[in-house]
């Protein structure tokens, strides 16, 4: 059962796992949610009746029954983790805490103009978990405007104390706001020989990398595969760090793999969701329950539905035994990972999918695409929407992309002459325009947010957000696309598609079925040569075949240029402008979305 409200002046008795310090009860709830075992918590607020050394303590708790006895206590605030909830969860915390000193290991001290600058510095520093900034009113003259970057083993403060005229806050890496590079490569036959901060068992290097990503101190990792010569180290995932933030030594070793934390690109890559099955593999751990199940998929469902289950091993039924049902062993451990991994015993193992909601919905795998042809099939581009105007008569106006449950990203030039959002309708999950009838459900538009530097498509800033009146319930046919990661600026996308209901040639009409075309990206230098009369800026991205023939056209505007990278689709461009359609040596020009990620997040995450 999902309980989101906080219980004031209430303390949960017993069940303590560990105590951390958090600046608020709200953040204590987030910490509890991300902790592998925490189901409930008690936070102590500052209060004259409470010992100051207990202020800001967040006691993480567990219970077999999923609840604990309640006791009345002034200044105590208790609640439940969001593990029990189905809604999307985020660790992003933009709050600034006034007059609080969040203590940790200060490793960088420098002058900053503002708390915002200090927070940005923290967000763009690989080691930083949180910061404290002494404001202009701080009593000690020499310490005014000092920005202290801090880290701890847990990512949370080691203590929090009241201190006038300072502010504290957290790194915004988990809000997708970091400019740090995102290195997704996994290096085979490589060992990073730096200090280990922790070690866990993992079935493969991908899971090891994901564990590293959500471990607060891990910057890179080394994984020893099941073929590693030293038996005691097989399936061992070593979580590592270094002062420079990069591995100091790389050693060539067969059967080992190494890689980096994906912290700065975690909003566009699954980090918590380990969805694969591992055949002929047994996960050992504390046994929670043993239940009969028809298949390993059914066993995974049982694990996902049991809030305390972290991973499972399924033993298929022996022929004609137990109505063909196998045994499903639901398991847990102190850190969420198996305590040991064994091979060759016939089990099929995997992890709970309960944590998938901690990942961005946009990272969910969608159905395989149809190769060849130009017409799309249902569910192939579930982020694509058709934006209609109802004035003077209803018609398709532009394309757009779902980027959040209340947000559509499109082009600014679509709204030339649009006086009010009231005349707009957004249809999602549509394949054919002919499906749209009088009674077809749509999303009304609450607000049109056009980039304030937009003048005309050709001069850039051709980007707009639509805030919907109601939220989109994600399904297979309507779900978001990931924004590109700022750390992915140097990625070369090779699998890019433009989609829309636009014209197929310059003088044509809106198409009934959603069209798709695979189009290669063109460098900005090359693009500039093709458009000598225009300035192709770094905020634009171009795509097209030299010989022409495939391109976006009238009516595709605002729609996505979608590129697949590491199995995840990213919204790389917004269809903006071009000379004619599909002309030779005239590539299409798109808004370069990565350059607007800050703008998008600022507008969509505004309180």
């Amino acid at each position: 059962e999902c309980v989101t409200q906080l219980l004031k002046d209430t303390c949960f008795e017993g069940g303590d796992i560990t105590t951390v310090f958090t600046p608020s009860a709200k953040y204590c709830q987030v910490v509890c949610t991300y902790h592998p075992r925490c189901l409930l918590f008690t936070f102590t607020a500052e209060s004259p009746s409470e010992d100051p050394t207990r202020w800001f303590t967040c006691v993480l708790k567990d219970s077999v029954t999923e609840t604990l006895p309640r006791v009345n206590r002034t200044a105590a605030i208790s609640g439940y983790s969001f593990k029990q909830c189905s809604h999307q969860i985020s660790a992003c915390n933009k709050d600034i805490y006034v007059d609080l000193d969040m203590k940790g290991i200060n490793y960088n001290s420098s002058v900053a103009k503002s708390a915002q600058e200090c927070q940005e510095r923290c967000t763009d520093d690989v080691h930083c978990h949180f910061f404290t900034y002494a404001t202009r009113q701080f009593p000690s003259l020499e310490h005014r405007n000092i920005c202290l970057l801090k880290h701890t083993q847990t990512g949370t403060p080691t203590r929090i104390t009241k201190l006038d005229k300072v502010v504290s806050g957290f790194s915004l890496k988990s809000c997708a706001l970091s400019n740090l590079a995102c290195i997704r490569d996994i290096f085979p036959n490589t060992v990073f020989a730096d200090s280990n901060i922790d070690s866990v068992m993992a079935p493969d290097a991908f899971v090891c990398g994901r564990i590293c990503t959500h471990h607060p101190g891990c910057l890179f990792f080394t994984f020893f595969s099941q073929e590693w010569p030293k038996e005691s180290q097989r399936n061992l995932c070593l979580l590592k760090t270094s002062e420079s933030g990069l591995p100091s030594t790389r050693i060539k070793k067969s059967k080992a793999l190494s890689g980096f934390s994906l912290q700065s690109c975690r909003h566009s890559i699954p980090v918590f969701c380990h969805s694969s099955f591992y055949h002929d593999t047994d996960f050992l751990g504390e046994e929670l329950d043993i239940v009969a199940a028809k298949s390993h998929e059914a066993c995974q469902k049982l694990c996902t539905n049991a809030v305390r289950c972290q991973f499972f091993t399924y033993t298929p039924a022996q022929a004609s035994c137990n109505e063909g049902k196998g045994k499903c062993y639901l398991k847990l451990s102190s850190n969420g990972s198996p305590t040991k991994i064994l091979h060759g015993r016939g089990g099929i193992s995997g992890y709970t999918l309960r944590l998938c909601k901690m990942d961005n919905e946009c990272t969910t795998k969608i159905k395989p695409r149809i190769v060849g042809g130009t017409a799309s099939v249902r569910g192939e581009w579930p982020w694509q929407v058709t934006l209609h105007t109802t004035s003077p008569t209803q018609r398709h106006l532009c394309g757009g992309s779902i980027i959040g449950n209340q947000w559509i990203l499109t082009a600014a030039h679509c709204f030339y002459g649009v006086e009010s959002p009231k005349i707009l309708r957004v249809y999602s999950g549509i394949l054919n325009q002919s499906e749209i009838k009088e009674d077809t459900s749509f999303f009304g538009v609450q607000e049109i947010i056009i980039h304030d530097q937009y003048k005309m498509a050709e001069s850039g800033y051709d980007i707009a957000l639509l805030k919907l009146e109601t939220t989109v319930n994600y399904t297979d046919s309507q779900r978001p696309i990931c924004l590109p990661s700022k750390g992915d600026r140097n990625v070369i996308y090779t699998d890019c598609w433009v989609t829309g209901w636009g014209y197929r040639k310059l003088r044509d009409k809106i198409q009934n079925t959603l069209q798709k075309a695979k189009i290669p990206l063109v460098t900005n230098e090359e693009c500039q040569k093709r458009y000598r009369g225009h300035k192709i800026t770094h905020k634009m991205i171009c795509a097209g075949y030299r010989e022409g023939g495939k391109d976006a056209c009238k009516g595709d505007s605002g729609g996505p240029l979608s590129c697949k990278h590491n199995e995840v689709w990213h919204l790389v461009g917004i269809t903006s402008w071009g000379e004619g359609c599909a002309q030779r040596e005239r590539p299409g020009v798109y808004t370069n979305v990565v350059e607007y990620v800050d703008w998008i997040l600022e507008k969509t995450q505004a309180v």
């Epitope: 290991i105 200060n106 490793y107 960088n108 001290s109 000690s140 310490h143 006038d164």
Partner: antibody, heavy 115, light 107 residues
Amino acid sequence: QVQLEESGPGLVAPSQSLSITCTVSGFSLTGYGIYWVRQPPGKGLEWLGMIWGDGRTDYNSALKSRLSISKDNSKSQVFLKMNSLQTDDTARYYCARDYYGSKDYWGQGTTLTVS
Amino acid sequence: DIVMTQSHKFMSTSVGDRVSITCKASQDVSTAVAWYQQKPGQSPKLLIYLTSYRNTGVPDRFTGSGSGTDFTFTISSVQAEDLAVYYCQQHYKTPYSFGGGTKLERL
């Protein structure tokens, strides 16, 4: 845990120079300022100077011309150099860690005799 | 430079007494004053910073108050282990400076 340890020559002849090292552990010098304070026998505390996390320095006005503070972040060491020593520089020399201008951790001190 | 003056070099007290030590700054130092305790043969120990904030682990019988130029350090109920020298220090502006110290001794 946080520790600071001073090491010095113990005895120095008048007009000679002094070099004291403060070696720290449990924290990083890039994130904290370090102070030097001295205490002549039977007397009070005298603030000598400091080096900030970012390397800036501040000195006691009366001693500025004779003092120099530097550090090596990678070795976690802070250095106090003082020249033209006189007998009234005889004191116990302490290094201490900065917490918003106050000194939250102190070393045990090293005794210097100028004679 | 800012001069800190502790008017009493010595103060006599008994266990259980309330005692207050004063410190005066030669110019306004806002609330940037710290208090230290030093016992014979030991390094000074930070008790109070920014006038009234107690350092970690410091008993609540130690308090500080004041602002501008006049500051007071109070022990609400003196314990035998509190007999020591107490120094004030301004940390408003470098060069930072200490008061001359007040020795708290048994009556």
